[in-house]
Amino acid sequence: RLSWYDPDFQARLTRSNSKCQGQLEVYLKDGWHMVCSQSWGRSSKQWEDPSQASKVCQRLNCGVPLSLGPFLVTYTPQSSIICYGQLGSFSNCSHSRNDMCHSLGLTCLEPQKTTPPTTRPPPTTTPEPTAPPRLQLVAQSGGQHCAGVVEFYSGSLGGTISYEAQDKTQDLENFLCNNLQCGSFLKHLPETEAGRAQDPGEPREHQPLPIQWKIQNSSCTSLEHCFRKIKPQKSGRVLALLCSGFQPKVQSRLVGGSSICEGTVEVRQGAQWAALCDSSSARSSLRWEEVCREQQCGSVNSYRVLDAGDPTSRGLFCPHQKLSQCHELWERNSYCKKVFVTCQDPNP
């Protein structure tokens, strides 16, 4: 049966800065085809259990699948197909009219970096503990990878890390993000964002843990020296981090231009697309270079801020220079200045 389980099956994820997330295209017969999200009897708004696409993520040398569902922005390449039968089967597909096709999106975890962990092994004179010390980031259900409450485990003991806002811990946070193979530290998360409040019906492993740690050495270079055990606090903050490797990233598109390589910039917040408002923190072309790359266009030719005379013009705002650093977009309900970007078109 011809399906994404076939060992020779080829897929790729396009229209994103990462090879591990984007619009699903498959090689079939004569070339690459975009897969419509209406395939296999699904509706264009339906989200699937992503684990069914684990073979695709694996073949792309990415981690486990995080989401499988409508990509919400459809770029139609030369060809799009709707397939029938079981999910992931390509035995019975037909060409779709491009205006009828909503593309299927897949997000897989970025691959783990193959650099050796920064934790040094304990000196050979000490007995080996039952398990080496390790970290875990616990996100909200359906939350992001590389973002969440930090839990530290040493042997059989595990718990959150007490954190005071005045703690000067930048080096430690970089070390922790790096140890988690999540890149570098971006910012602290408020606990509501990080998902500390637990649903009473949650599985046992996500219930609050019985012990807590305090930062002992913010310049530590091996995990066993970073924290010391304390009595659990009823109140107070716990350490919650956002690292640069967070996923899924903000997606962008260009609309209203004469090709997919020019137009007003829109970004996606959840299932909604909205205009990206101009930001004083992004006056350089870096942000727009990244947007052009995501559309698979060449470098930026020009960008101009459109006048926001209309007090009712709404949109989304990213406070960082690059969209890839934006873990959340803020709503702007008035005077949103849109930006019109023109990228080089690789296929003029």
């Epitope: 049966r1 011809l2 076939d6 020779d8 099956f9 080829q10 790729r12 090689y27 079939l28 017969k29 004569d30 070339g31 690459w32 030369q78 390509f90 035995s91 019975n92």
Partner: antibody, heavy 120, light 106 residues
Framework: QVTLKESGPVLVKPTETLTLTCTFS??????????VGWIRQAPGKGLEWVAH???????YYNPSLKSRLTITKDASKDQVSLKLSSVTAADTAVYYC????????????WGQGTLVTVSS | NIVMTQSPSSLSASVGDRVTITCQAS??????VAWYQQKPDQSPKLLIY???TRHTGVPDRFTGSGSGTDFTLTISSLQPEDIATYFC????????FGSGTKLEIK
């Protein structure tokens, strides 16, 4: 094991229609993902893809030959036929029957080829 | 139509030599490239597909690499039975072949 064998006329007159048949074994054109096609090679020259037919009756033709080509299959007989109309001396070549899978694994099995000469 | 420019058109090498044949596509073909070996009076045989995957039974001295527009077939240690003409093939959009490289023993 997979085998493909071409059959058809050795000599065809200009303006006539060339009909070639490929008989294969070791796989079925009813199996999803399977395709059979034709590639030709003029004497002392390179390879030129001609046409392909897939398990689901989808057909693809070389754009430069499309107007003169028809490819059909009879899956129950394990045969694929190619018709090339209005032949000229430029169509003189060894015609190979080839198998290909939809996943893009190249032309993985080839027939021995049959030399067709177009001459009056 | 995508044009595949293959070079050299012929080359002479000694047994044990490392041999490299290149193919350049007129536009980006990703990794949808295959390589074939054709010995005199025989039909071509598939060596490599998807740029670097060896077909069943192909010796590991044959390796393929590249992506986008530039592709290479390498024979790490030339054997007498490798004397043949080699063709590249792109299948990113329809199918086109390189003009061939005739490999001879010095």
């Amino acid at each position: 094991q997979v085998t493909l064998k071409e059959s058809g006329p050795v000599l065809v007159k200009p303006t006539e229609t060339l009909t070639l048949t490929c008989t294969f074994s070791g796989f079925s054109l009813s199996t999803s993902g399977m395709g059979v096609g034709w590639i030709r090679q003029a004497p002392g020259k390179g390879l030129e893809w001609v046409a392909h037919i897939w398990w689901d009756d989808d057909v693809y033709y070389n754009p430069s030959l499309k107007s003169r080509l028809t490819i059909t299959k009879d899956a129950s007989k394990d045969q694929v036929s190619l018709k090339l109309s209005s032949v000229t001396a430029a169509d003189t070549a060894v015609y190979y029957c080839v198998r290909r899978r939809a996943t893009g694994t190249g032309f993985d099995y080839w027939g021995q080829g049959t030399l067709v000469t177009v001459s009056s | 139509n995508i044009v595949m420019t293959q070079s050299p058109s012929s080359l002479s090498a000694s047994v044990g030599d490392r041999v490299t044949i290149t193919c350049q596509a007129s536009q980006d073909v990703g990794t949808a490239v295959a390589w074939y070996q054709q010995k005199p009076d025989q039909s071509p045989k598939l060596l490599i597909y998807w740029t670097s995957t060896r077909h069943t039974g192909v010796p590991d001295r044959f390796t393929g690499s590249g992506s986008g527009t530039d592709f290479t077939l390498t024979i790490s240690s030339l054997q007498p039975e490798d004397i043949a003409t080699y063709f590249c093939h792109q299948y990113n959009s329809y199918n086109t072949f390189g003009s061939g490289t005739k490999l001879e023993i010095k």
